[in-house]
Interface confidence: medium
Amino acid sequence: EEELQVIQPDKSVLVAAGETATLRCTATSLIPVGPIQWFRGAGPGRELIYNQKEGHFPRVTTVSDLTKRNNMDFSIRIGNITPADAGTYYCVKFRKGSPDDVEFKSGAGTELSVRAKPSAPVVSGPAARATPQHTVSFTCESHGFSPRDITLKWFKNGNELSDFQTNVDPVGESVSYSIHSTAKVVLTREDVHSQVICEVAHVTLQGDPLRGTANLSETIRVPPTLEVTQQPVRAENQVNVTCQVRKFYPQRLQLTWLENGNVSRTETASTVTENKDGTYNWMSWLLVNVSAHRDDVKLTCQVEHDGQPAVSKSHDLKVSAHPKEQGSNTAAENTGSNER
């Protein structure tokens, strides 16, 4: 009679993470008598996966009933596969011996490869806000996928970005991999409503890529433009001066009025109006009692936006006396200057 052979017909098996792997193994003879064991890896460091004779292997089930006398099918199923299960599995026939069974013959091995989906990409932006025309970096990370081949793309509002660096780690062989990418994005004043998208495509996703997003509203700071104007005189001795604060983001803004360098009033932007591009406008006004001033008045609108150094715009009120009339009249001249 021919000597027993252990046949593992599948050189390789590819299984998705979470699924069950079937590892096939048959013997060509019932002789010699003795158990079958399954190992992952070869040599002294091999890992026992299943022992027909003894032990508890909760994830392993046999395909056929190994208690039947004439059984020669030693195939097993391993449940709930993870990337850590990848490796080469050997079906090994032992011969009954005393006191221990003796290894008789091994199959050629079946390489188990695990396909694991990447985790949802996580996109993170810079810790501090930046202003338009500046370049900021966004990172995208996804983990736990296998095999290594993966495609990552960056988009800003649907337009693909090209300025990015991507690493897949580790560089060598591993049971699963991580991807890390850094993209550079130039901010514009219109980016309050913009989104940066990181898209990851992998064989396990069957053409339906995963996306991670970041809103540029969390990254951008659009500094305000200021305009100080004098409104028509309400009463004979009063002038209404307004400060238009336009196109700023985020909303956090504090405005201080100064008369000849002295603080007159401080207020916080509350009832703002929103522009189509997501920036805000706000107006503050100051009623100046001209009769209280003998000399020209320098009015300054000083704005502190989002904790940044204050910007200001000034307006000179020319105060001149007309002897024909009682009290003092005003001639106002807008000599606004931008001061930082």
Partner: antibody, heavy 119, light 107 residues
Framework: QVQLVQSGAEVKKPGASVKVSCKAS????????MHWVRQVPGQGLEWMGW????????KYSQKFQGRVTITRDTSATTAYMELSSLRSEDTAVYYC????????????WGKGTTVTVSS | DIQVTQSPSSLSASVGDRVTITCRAS??????LNWYQQKPGKAPKLLIH???SLQNGVPSRFSGSGSGTDFSLTINSLQPEDFATYYC?????????FGGGTKVEIK
């Protein structure tokens, strides 16, 4: 035995290019990566990039991107490293080293090629 | 990029001493860490790969350990030929990076 033989020392002027060769023998050339590492006098080791000799895949260190070109000729079992726009700070010993495909360690090194950049 | 910090930068020891050099990675690199020895005017020589695997032909007085971010190279019973500079190198992520080196000098 496994050996990496590098080309001889070079003296270059700033702005010029240098091309260093690394001839491999004693093993299957296409089964490994070839790394290029440099060492400025009195300083540590600095990885420049690698080429997988089998499929030609290349990875450069961002520091040298745009200035370094790594190639290989499988029939000649030789790897090449070209560095352009040379400056005085590029004066260094340039090593090629055979790389493992799993842990990416460098187990066999060439003797090094001294490149001097001077006007 | 992963930074690799080696310490100490230099040490003085005598023949027969037990010497330990440490290497710390700025993020977890599993066991993708290798150790090299370099003597003046010579190319580096691989001692240990995969954190703890001794390279063929390297004396058993050299040993490596660690995983994640902290690693060490130990030389048991320092020999005259061991006075050299030692470098660790992470091979987890590109750009591959080396530690700054540790010079082992004769006391």
């Amino acid at each position: 035995q496994v050996q990496l033989v590098q080309s001889g020392a070079e003296v270059k002027k700033p702005g010029a290019s240098v091309k260093v060769s690394c001839k491999a023998s004693g093993y299957t050339f296409t089964s490994n990566a070839m790394h290029w590492v440099r060492q400025v006098p009195g300083q540590g080791l600095e990885w420049m990039g690698w080429i997988k000799a089998g499929n030609g895949e290349i990875k450069y260190s961002q520091k040298f991107q745009g200035r370094v070109t790594i190639t290989r000729d499988t029939s000649a079992t030789t790897a090449y490293m070209e560095l352009s726009s040379l400056r005085s700070e590029d004066t260094a010993v340039y090593y090629c080293a055979r790389g493992d495909y799993y842990y990416y360690y460098m187990d066999v090194w060439g003797k090094g090629t001294t490149v001097t950049v001077s006007s | 990029d992963i930074q690799v910090t080696q310490s100490p930068s230099s040490l003085s020891a005598s023949v027969g001493d037990r010497v330990t050099i440490t290497c710390r990675a700025s993020q977890s690199i599993s066991d993708f860490l290798n150790w090299y020895q370099q003597k003046p005017g010579k190319a580096p020589k691989l001692l240990i790969h995969a954190a703890s695997s001794l390279q063929n032909g390297v004396p058993s007085r050299f040993s490596g350990s660690g995983s994640g971010t902290d690693f060490s190279l130990t030389i048991n019973s320092l020999q005259p030929e061991d006075f050299a500079t030692y470098y660790c190198q992470q091979s987890y992520s590109t750009p591959l990076s080396f530690g700054g080196g540790t010079k082992v000098e004769i006391k």
